[in-house]
C-alpha cells in the first residue's frame, strides 16, 4: 500500500489564552529524512495555509519568525500548537504531511481537528 | 487571481537544448510545490517534473532524468525547465502547473509547444 | 509506480444520459484526481481526493471509489462535457495519470 494514513484528534478546545495544541501523527511508508508539516484551516469550504515547517527527523520543527504556531516532533509524531487564537478562527485545522526526502514522495492529509474558541469574557470593573 | 503562463517553447534539432519559463502570480509562490506536465500530439498527459517550496527538493520522471532540471527563483515568481539532449520523443505541449492545497494540479498553465524535429 | 487504467477508452451518450467512467490502480490510495480536458485548453480540475468537487465545479460531477477501484459519474450530460477525462494519483511519486476517456456525443 502506497498511501500514508495521517492522524489527529477529531476535537480541541483552545485555552482561555487563545492557544490549542494537537499531536499529528503520520504512519510513515519509507524512512523519510525530511518531512514538511503543514496546518490548513478549513471553514464555509474556504481553506487557508495557517503555517508550515520543515524539520530533519530527529530536529525541531523550525516555523517562520512571525508564524502563530509552534512544535516538537518525535518520530512519526508532531505537537503543534497554534496561539493567539480569537472566536472568530474556530475552524477545522488539517495536518498536511509531506515525506520530501529521500525519495519517493509521500503525501499524507489528516481529517482535520475542530479547534473551538471562546473569547474570555471582558473582567468588570472593580470599585477600589 | 491564480495565473500561470509559460514561454519558451519552439522547433529545436534534437540533441540541442530549450529553456522553459512559467511566471506565476496572484498566489504566494513559495508556498506551492509546481509541476511540469507534457502531452504529446493526440496522447494523454504525462507528468515531467516538480519543485517543492524553496526549490532544494526536485523529482523527475524517469524519462527525462539526467537530461531535463527544473529550477524556480522566488524572488520573481517563475519556475523554469532546462531542457538538454532533447529527442523527438520529447515534442509535446508543456504545461506548468500548481499543486493545491489538498495535492492535486489546482491550476494549469495554457501551454507551450516545444517540437523536435531536424 | 502506481499504474492508473482507465475504461472505457470512449464513451459514446447523449446529451442528458448519465456518463460512468472507471479508474483502477495498480496500488491502493487515497489521494486520486480527475481532470476534464477540451480540445486545445488545459486540463480543468474537476474532483480531488476521489470524491471532493473542486471550487466551482457543477454538483452534476461526481467522484466515489476509495483503495484500487475510482468512478467518476456525470449526470446529466451538457453539450459542454463532452471531452477527455483522466485521472491522477497524486499521493506518492511519481505522479501518474491513467490513459484518458473520450467521453464523445452519439
Known amino acids: 500500500c502506497k498511501a500514508m494514513h495521517v492522524a489527529q484528534p477529531a476535537v480541541v478546545l483552545a485555552s482561555s489564552r487563545g492557544i490549542a495544541s494537537f499531536v499529528c501523527e503520520y504512519a510513515s511508508p519509507g524512512k523519510a529524512t525530511e518531512v514538511r508539516v503543514t496546518v490548513l484551516r478549513q471553514a464555509d469550504s474556504q481553506v487557508t495555509e495557517v503555517c508550515a515547517a520543515t524539520y530533519m527527523m530527529g530536529n525541531e520543527l523550525t516555523f517562520l519568525d512571525d508564524s502563530i504556531c509552534t512544535g516538537t516532533s518525535s518520530g512519526n509524531q508532531v505537537n503543534l500548537t497554534i496561539q493567539g487564537l480569537r472566536a472568530m478562527d474556530t475552524g477545522l485545522y488539517i495536518c498536511k504531511v509531506e515525506l520530501m526526502y529521500p525519495p519517493p514522495y509521500y503525501l499524507g492529509i489528516g481529517n482535520g481537528t475542530q479547534i473551538y474558541v471562546i473569547d474570555p469574557e471582558p473582567c468588570p470593573d472593580s470599585d477600589f | 487571481q491564480v495565473q500561470l503562463v509559460e514561454s519558451g517553447g519552439g522547433v529545436v534539432q534534437p540533441g540541442r537544448s530549450l529553456r522553459l519559463s512559467c511566471a506565476a502570480s496572484?498566489?504566494?509562490?513559495?508556498?506551492?510545490?509546481i509541476h511540469w506536465v507534457r502531452q504529446a500530439p493526440g496522447k494523454g498527459l504525462e507528468w515531467v517534473a516538480v519543485?517543492?517550496?524553496?526549490?532544494?527538493?526536485?523529482y523527475y520522471a524517469d524519462s527525462v532524468k539526467g537530461r531535463f532540471t527544473i529550477s524556480r527563483d522566488n524572488s520573481k515568481n517563475t519556475l523554469y525547465l532546462q531542457m538538454n539532449s532533447l529527442r523527438a520523443e520529447d515534442t509535446a505541449v508543456y504545461y506548468c502547473?500548481?499543486?493545491?492545497?489538498?495535492?492535486?494540479?489546482?491550476?494549469w498553465g495554457q501551454g507551450t509547444l516545444v517540437t523536435v524535429s531536424s | 509506480e502506481i499504474v492508473l487504467t482507465q475504461s472505457p477508452d470512449t464513451l459514446s451518450l447523449s446529451p442528458g444520459e448519465r456518463a460512468t467512467l472507471s479508474c483502477r490502480a495498480s496500488?491502493?490510495?487515497?489521494?486520486l484526481a480527475w481532470y476534464q480536458q477540451k480540445p486545445g485548453q488545459a486540463p480543468r480540475l474537476l474532483i480531488y481526493?476521489?470524491?471532493s468537487r473542486a471550487t466551482g465545479i457543477p454538483d452534476r460531477f461526481s467522484g466515489s471509489g476509495s483503495g484500487t477501484d475510482f468512478t467518476l459519474t456525470i449526470s446529466g450530460l451538457q453539450p459542454e462535457d463532452f471531452a477527455v477525462y483522466y485521472c491522477?494519483?497524486?499521493?506518492?511519486?511519481?505522479?501518474?495519470f491513467g490513459q484518458g476517456t473520450k467521453v464523445e456525443i452519439k
Open positions: 502547473a500548481r499543486a493545491g492545497n489538498w495535492g492535486p494540479f489546482d491550476y
Open positions: 496572484g498566489f504566494t509562490f513559495s508556498s506551492y510545490g
Open positions: 519543485i517543492w517550496y524553496d526549490g532544494r527538493n526536485k
Open positions: 496500488q491502493s490510495t487515497n489521494y
Open positions: 481526493g476521489a470524491s
Open positions: 491522477q494519483q497524486y499521493g506518492t511519486s511519481p505522479w501518474t
